[in-house]
Interface confidence: medium
């Protein structure tokens, strides 16, 4: 196989008895993406697969970047919080049991949720064989794979390969269509010697040789252009050092009252379980660990406050206190922990060192192609398409990997809008109620009428503002029974949610400005009722007077209007959103400084922003009754997060509203918190921390959609599968490995 040129078969070349291509899912644990480029000459077989087939620059692992969570994510398409294997070690208070890789408890089906690929295949009449895979020797939903091997790490790789080849030789009636294969390398060697070590180089040669044996075996059976093979890894690997340790004894006078899962992705819970599990004061722990040292190498979070892109919160097994650790550092209880040096993983899944490989080859895959990175939650849907079966519900976005396939099996379409919109009509330029709002600059009702009359756009003006400010179409509402209306302005368009009494989204386009100086200040102390929205559906300005902690923010920044006259279009109740004062500082800095910078760098940006309500921190928009539960004696619910989606043209010679090709996206989901303690901003100007904070909370457009019940880009003229690629793209700014 190795000696031959790449075969370019237009359709599958399967021998007699192979009606449809088998699928082999092959995992090499801890194979970080960089190995593929640095050591390519040492791995001729894997390198040939890369050259002849399709590969991504890298595949993103899910957080924490550990073995069991990610292997099970790959075969279920679910986030660890959804499938339950949230770490290699964990405690479940409901089961009152501990899960670890060294105990038989790992084979208790109660730990394993979701539907793994082998069951999906079997439920639809196909056979499945697993040569090791986390979960494969567990009776998930009462069933095992058709063929499986109890895990034994000492079985030589060559023996594993020859067994899989024997399975392919089985009679048609007994032969599986789906296979898994698992190698512990190069992870074991990476742990022992670190990612840049002779041991890893040796391990790469060993796994390449075994992989070559598989490909040669397929060739001998004339299956090398019949089998669809996916070669991937669960995560990467990074170097650790014994002088890069954070000890909890440096932060607490005593540590015996808590238990800590140590390492690159630490969690802290009560020591005395189950008794103290729920009463444990997680908030106090986080407070004690926040902003304690100028060079602190971890950030403490309550899990609901972690970046939403991680989807690591909604599971009782995920302890409430989480430490987000710097690259190559470890956080442990005390100096008695000497488990350092060598390699480790589990870190932030945006770190380049945590990136995993993805290569694929076979009749269904495109050839000699490199694709942009994607997340491992997408692989399950892809494998279902290869097997021509229906996936179980999962966190992947079906169709987002269609560009890997010669002929896509599943054609996605845009979601149907669930709640239709109305237009908030303009009746009277005088408000029927002031809603306790004041604008001293409007000294009589003639002036008030004049500024309100500006809200009464003609059809031509509406068409013009939509073209500029909604260049990709208005967000469609996928939540049920959401009474909302569109509000048109010359400089922005918003979708107003009547039950929430606030805009669900606001969309506007910031052009590339000649100068990048910050925006002028907003007209001070000027607010008025929006005459297009009935008072019963509006916020009162007086809502913001009682509790000094909450102030009003503007979703569309009034200062974006270059003249104070047009600022009045934004100084209205329908543009108000509740914000903590500390949060607003950051929000205002982003809009007055960073947004201008982005617009300048990108030849203009379209901005869509809005509130998010995720009180139950499940990554999906809350039902109205969930939000009502959190109304603190007020009509106005306080958002848990705010989103901002910046969209520009990939080809920077075009503006967003005249973009013929691919778009570039930069979405943010910023937790709405009363303090900025996450950034330790004491004594620091905003320029030193706001951008870093926004960058920490970058997300995918898809994450925004799930949290808001909105659907974006429906009017962008582009195949839906390409739009889904855009929606599942996560911008990253990590440069060092």
């Amino acid at each position: 196989w190795l000696e031959e040129n790449c075969d370019t078969a237009q359709q599958s070349q399967c021998p007699e008895g192979f009606d449809l291509p088998p699928v082999i899912l092959f995992s090499m644990d801890g194979f970080r993406a960089e190995y593929l480029y640095t050591w390519d000459t040492l791995m001729p077989n894997i390198n040939k697969l890369k050259t002849c087939g399709i590969h991504s620059k890298y595949m993103r692992a899910m957080y924490p970047t550990k073995t069991f969570p990610n292997h099970y994510t790959i075969v279920t398409g679910l986030y660890p919080e959804s499938h339950g294997i949230i770490d290699n070690n964990m405690y479940d208070v409901n089961l009152n049991k501990n899960f670890s890789l060294s105990s038989k408890e790992q084979n208790n089906p109660a730990w394993w949720h979701g539907q793994p690929m082998w069951l999906t295949a079997m439920y639809q009449g196909l056979k499945a064989a697993t040569y090791f895979w986390p979960g494969s020797e567990v009776a998930i939903n009462g069933s095992f794979p058709s063929i499986y091997m109890p895990y034994n790490g000492s079985v030589p790789f060559e023996e594993r390969i020859s067994t899989l080849l024997k399975w392919l030789d089985l009679p048609k009636a007994e032969r599986p269509r789906f296979y898994t294969m698992y190698f512990e390398e190069p992870d074991s060697s990476g742990h022992a010697g670190g990612p840049v070590s002779a041991r890893v180089i040796k391990a790469l040669q060993v796994v390449d040789h075994a992989f070559g044996m598989l490909m040669e075996g397929l060739k001998q059976r004339n299956l090398h252009n019949c089998v669809n093979i996916i070669l991937l890894a669960d995560h990467g690997m990074d170097q650790t050092y014994c002088n890069k340790m954070e000890y909890m004894t440096d932060y607490f006078p005593r540590i015996n009252f808590f238990y800590m899962y140590e390492g690159p992705a630490p969690r802290i819970r009560a020591h005395n379980i189950p008794h103290d599990f729920f009463s444990f004061n997680s908030e106090e722990i986080v407070r004690n660990l926040s902003c304690r040292k100028p060079d602190q190498h971890f950030k403490p979070y309550l899990t609901p406050d972690l970046p939403k892109r991680l989807h690591y919160a909604k599971n009782v097994r995920i302890d409430k206190v989480h430490l987000f650790v710097d690259q190559q550092w470890l956080a442990v209880r005390s100096k008695s922990n000497t488990n350092c040096g060598g390699g480790n993983h589990g870190y932030n899944n945006e770190f380049r060192s945590m990136e995993a490989i993805f290569l694929a080859h076979g009749p269904s895959f495109k050839e000699k192609t490199e694709v942009e990175p994607f997340e491992n939650i997408e692989v399950y849907n892809l494998m279902c398409d290869l097997l021509r079966i229906q996936p179980a519900p999962n966190n992947g976005t079906h169709g987002s990997l269609n560009h890997l396939l010669k002929v896509p099996f599943y054609e996605p379409s845009h979601a149907e809008e669930v709640s239709k919109f109305s237009v908030c009509g303009f009746a009277n330029p005088l408000p029927t109620e002031s809603l306790d709002c004041f604008c001293p600059h409007l000294q009589n009702s003639t002036q008030l009428e004049q500024v309100n009359q500006m809200l009464n756009l003609t059809q031509e003006e509406i068409t013009a503002t939509v073209k500029v400010n909604l260049p990709f179409g208005r967000p469609r509402v996928l939540q049920k029974n959401v009474d909302h209306c569109l509000l048109y302005h010359r400089e922005y368009v918003s979708g107003f949610g009547k039950a929430m009494r606030m805009p669900m989204w606001s969309s506007y386009t910031v052009p590339q400005l000649g100068d990048t100086s910050p925006l002028p200040p907003t007209v001070p102390d000027c607010l008025r009722a929006d005459v297009r929205v009935p008072p019963s559906e509006s916020q009162k300005c007086s809502f913001y007077l009682a509790d000094k902690n909450i102030t009003h923010g503007f979703l569309y920044p009034p200062a974006s209007n270059r003249t104070s006259d047009s600022q009045y279009d934004a100084l209205i109740t329908s543009n108000l959103v509740p914000m903590y004062e500390e949060f607003r500082k950051m929000w205002d800095y982003f809009h007055s400084v960073l947004l201008i910078k982005h617009a300048t760098e990108r030849n203009g940006v379209n901005v869509v922003s809005g509130p998010i309500f995720d009180y139950n921190y499940d990554g999906h928009f809350d039902a109205p009754d969930e939000i009502t539960k959190h109304l603190a004696n007020t009509d106005v619910p306080i958002p848990t997060h705010y989103f901002v989606v910046l969209t520009s043209c990939k080809n920077k010679s075009h503006t967003p509203e005249n973009c013929p090709g691919w778009l570039d996206v930069l979405p943010f989901i910023i937790p709405h918190r009363p303090t900025n303690v996450e950034s330790c901003p004491e004594g620091k100007p905003e320029a030193l921390w706001v951008e870093e904070r926004f960058t920490a909370h970058i997300a995918r457009v898809r994450d925004v959609e799930l949290l808001t019940g909105l659907d974006f880009y429906q009017d962008k003229v582009q195949p839906v599968s390409e739009i889904l690629q855009l929606k599942t793209y996560l911008p990253t700014f990590e440069t060092t490995i």
């Epitope: 009277n428 005088l430 109620e433 004041f438 409007l442 009589n444 009702s445 102390d525």
Partner: antibody, heavy 99, light 114 residues
């Protein structure tokens, strides 16, 4: 009921109508911008009251229909700018509704 | 709507004595960022329209004698006539112009000479 303004620019100030039944307090009825003729009425009078103006003679009008005995009152016009109290009042017109 | 409640309903004071009228609003009429209370006091003599005495809770309208003063903030306000004169016999009304429309008035306090 009519209300003729003098001594200032009629269109620069809003006209409000307030009534007072004998021996009772003051009750706000509605508001008109003489410049545009736009009006806002108190909920209680919605559908029964109409406020108009003739700028050429600097006069505001208030019409109340379907009168009942409890509408017997003195009807005042008053002027104001938007977020200020009523600085000048008309002398009032007594309207008596009899069966 | 904001409800204004005055006390007492009527008041008899000797000439030259102090008269104090209270007014309570059902919600705050203080616009905190301007630190202004949107409250006015009017005087109405028999057979006459009301006359503006005080606005912003404590600012005297021009031409109003300085024996009239207003105080208070938020929801509780007071009109004080420091030395009652015969011409001060009237009904006094407080009015909020904070949450409008509607502009709402207190029920009135009648001041007489004892």
């Amino acid at each position: 009921v009519s209300c003729k303004a003098s001594g200032y620019t009629f269109t620069s100030y809003d006209i409000h109508w307030v009534r007072q039944a004998t021996g009772q307090g003051l009750e706000w009825m509605g508001w008109m911008n003489p410049n545009s003729g736009n009006t806002v009425y108190a909920q209680k009078f919605q559908g029964r009251v109409t406020m108009t103006r003739n700028t050429s003679i600097s006069t505001a009008y208030m019409e109340l229909s379907s009168l009942r005995s409890e509408d017997t009152a003195v009807y005042y016009c008053a002027r104001t700018v938007l977020l200020w109290p009523f600085d000048y009042w008309g002398q009032g017109t007594l309207v008596t509704v009899s069966s | 709507d904001i409800v204004m409640t005055q006390s007492p309903d009527s008041l008899a004071v000797s000439l030259g004595e102090r008269a104090t009228i209270n007014c309570k609003s059902s919600q705050s009429v203080l616009y905190s960022s301007k630190n202004k209370n949107y409250l006015a006091w009017y005087q109405q003599k028999p057979g006459q329209p009301p006359k503006l005495l005080i606005y912003w809770a404590s600012t005297r309208e021009s031409g109003v004698p300085d024996r009239f003063s207003g105080s208070g903030s938020g929801t509780d306000f007071t009109l004080t006539i420091s030395s009652l004169q015969a011409e001060d016999v009237a009904v006094y009304y407080c009015q909020q112009y904070y949450s409008t429309p509607p502009w709402t008035f207190g029920q009135g306090t009648k001041v007489e000479i004892k």
